[in-house]
Interface confidence: low
Amino acid sequence: QGNRWRRSKRASYVSNPICKGCLSCSKDNGCSRCQQKLFFFLRREGMRQYGECLHSCPSGYYGHRAPDMNRCARCRIENCDSCFSKDFCTKCKVGFYLHRGRCFDECPDGFAPLEETMECVEGCEVGHWSEWGTCSRNNRTCGFKWGLETRTRQIVKKPAKDTIPCPTIAESRRCKMAMRHCPGGKRTPKAKEKRNKKKKRKLIERAQEQHSVFLATDRANQ
């Protein structure tokens, strides 16, 4: 059935609208030369190809102007749906973001995805990460087995749109403390806790004593 259709299609080629805009048209290959300003496009059928002359190239192709003949050339940009030239994409495939004529599954650093247009727009510009800080906890570098180390980066430029969030400017990770026990009798958390309880008890006792003195003085004055 496919071959019958192919034969009948080829037989009526010269009168077929496919020859529109051709300078030369054959029953075997369709157009081989186009009128000025039209683009030559090869349409495939089985493993035979047919030439057509088009005002604009189909999706996935761009118009390449050349002295001998203008032709439709394939967009060779990865994940591109339509392009303006050999290396400049104008519309990406679904799920990809357009950025400077290329298609990305994630916007490059410094750019943020604008979902409504599927483009990468200038995002919140941040500086380089600082070195990881000292491993510490509660501002102490000892007395714990595990601590946290932090690194930061500065916001260099605020985003163009308020809806675009800035990336994280501080991050922490768990780290092993250099010293589990503090030198020079510095107390571990448990010892500190005991000391605090003792201090609290003394304060309560002192407060009670002062209150008794106050009551006694008050009675004497009456």
Epitope: N29, S32, Q49, G60
Partner: antibody
Framework: EVQLVESGGGLVKPEGSLKLSCVAS????????MSWVRQAPGQGLEWVAH??????????YYSGSVKGRFSISRDDSRNMVYLQMNNLRTEDTATYYC??????????WGQGTQVTVSS | QPVLTQSPSVSASLGASVKLTCTLS???????IEWYQQHPDKSPKFLMQ??????SKGDGTPDRFSGSSSGAHRYLSISNLQLEDEAIYYC?????????FGSGTQLTLL
């Protein structure tokens, strides 16, 4: 940059089987027709098999010399094209090239993988 | 009669010009053809597609290479021959369900 890397070649006995693989990168693989072309030692080029894209229901074509013995397939999720070769003959000894065939000719070629069929 | 006929070898001098011929059989005389270049122990490389009176070059094909046609003949012309042009040149064409290559022409530089 378009890259095609073939693998799976080797020495096999007549009537044996071998599966060649080709991994593609640098272009949207699922959009492109793919072919295998071979070259016997000191000989010319011979087109072997061709596979269309999903749009064309992965239609396949084979040269007369391999029809019924070889099978071309593709895995778009892995950017791979395969050539399953069964009932191999000594005349199948060749370097097998993986090629892109989207622009209606073999515009990009891999480095090739050697297949030797010998007892 | 083979579908594509190429002369086995052609010799030319460095800096000169050469014209390689690929002749199509009568039933394919209106077809487009392609030219490929292959250096020893290297993969073939697509050079161009030749149509009636025009050609489309592949990426990286030098301007020194051009294609033309006359009747059933398709030509590959190379001007200002360079050492790197010494190679085998194949022509090829696609038909309804197969692709055919010529036997190749060995270009040797003198």
């Amino acid at each position: 940059e378009v890259q095609l890397v073939e693998s799976g070649g080797g020495l096999v006995k007549p009537e044996g089987s071998l599966k060649l693989s080709c991994v593609a990168s640098g272009f949207t693989f699922s959009d492109y027709f793919m072919s295998w072309v071979r070259q016997a030692p000191g000989q010319g080029l011979e087109w072997v098999a061709h596979i269309y894209t999903k749009t064309y229901n992965y239609a396949t074509y084979y040269s007369g010399s391999v029809k019924g013995r070889f099978s071309i397939s593709r895995d778009d999720s892995r950017n791979m094209v395969y050539l399953q070769m069964n009932n191999l003959r000594t005349e199948d000894t060749a370097t097998y090239y993986c090629t892109t065939d989207e622009d209606w000719y073999f515009d990009f070629w891999g480095q090739g993988t050697q297949v030797t069929v010998s007892s | 009669q083979p579908v594509l006929t190429q002369s086995p070898s052609v010799s030319a001098s460095l800096g000169a010009s050469v014209k390689l011929t690929c002749t199509l059989s009568s039933q394919h005389s209106t077809n487009y053809i392609e030219w490929y270049q292959q250096h020893p122990d290297k993969s073939p490389k697509f050079l161009m597609q030749v149509r009636d009176g025009s050609h489309s070059k592949g990426d990286g094909t030098p301007d020194r290479f051009s294609g033309s046609s006359s009747g059933a003949h398709r030509y590959l012309s190379i001007s200002n021959l360079q050492l790197e042009d010494e190679a085998i040149y194949y022509c090829g064409l696609s038909d309804v369900s197969l692709y055919l290559f010529g036997s190749g022409t060995q270009l040797t530089l003198l």
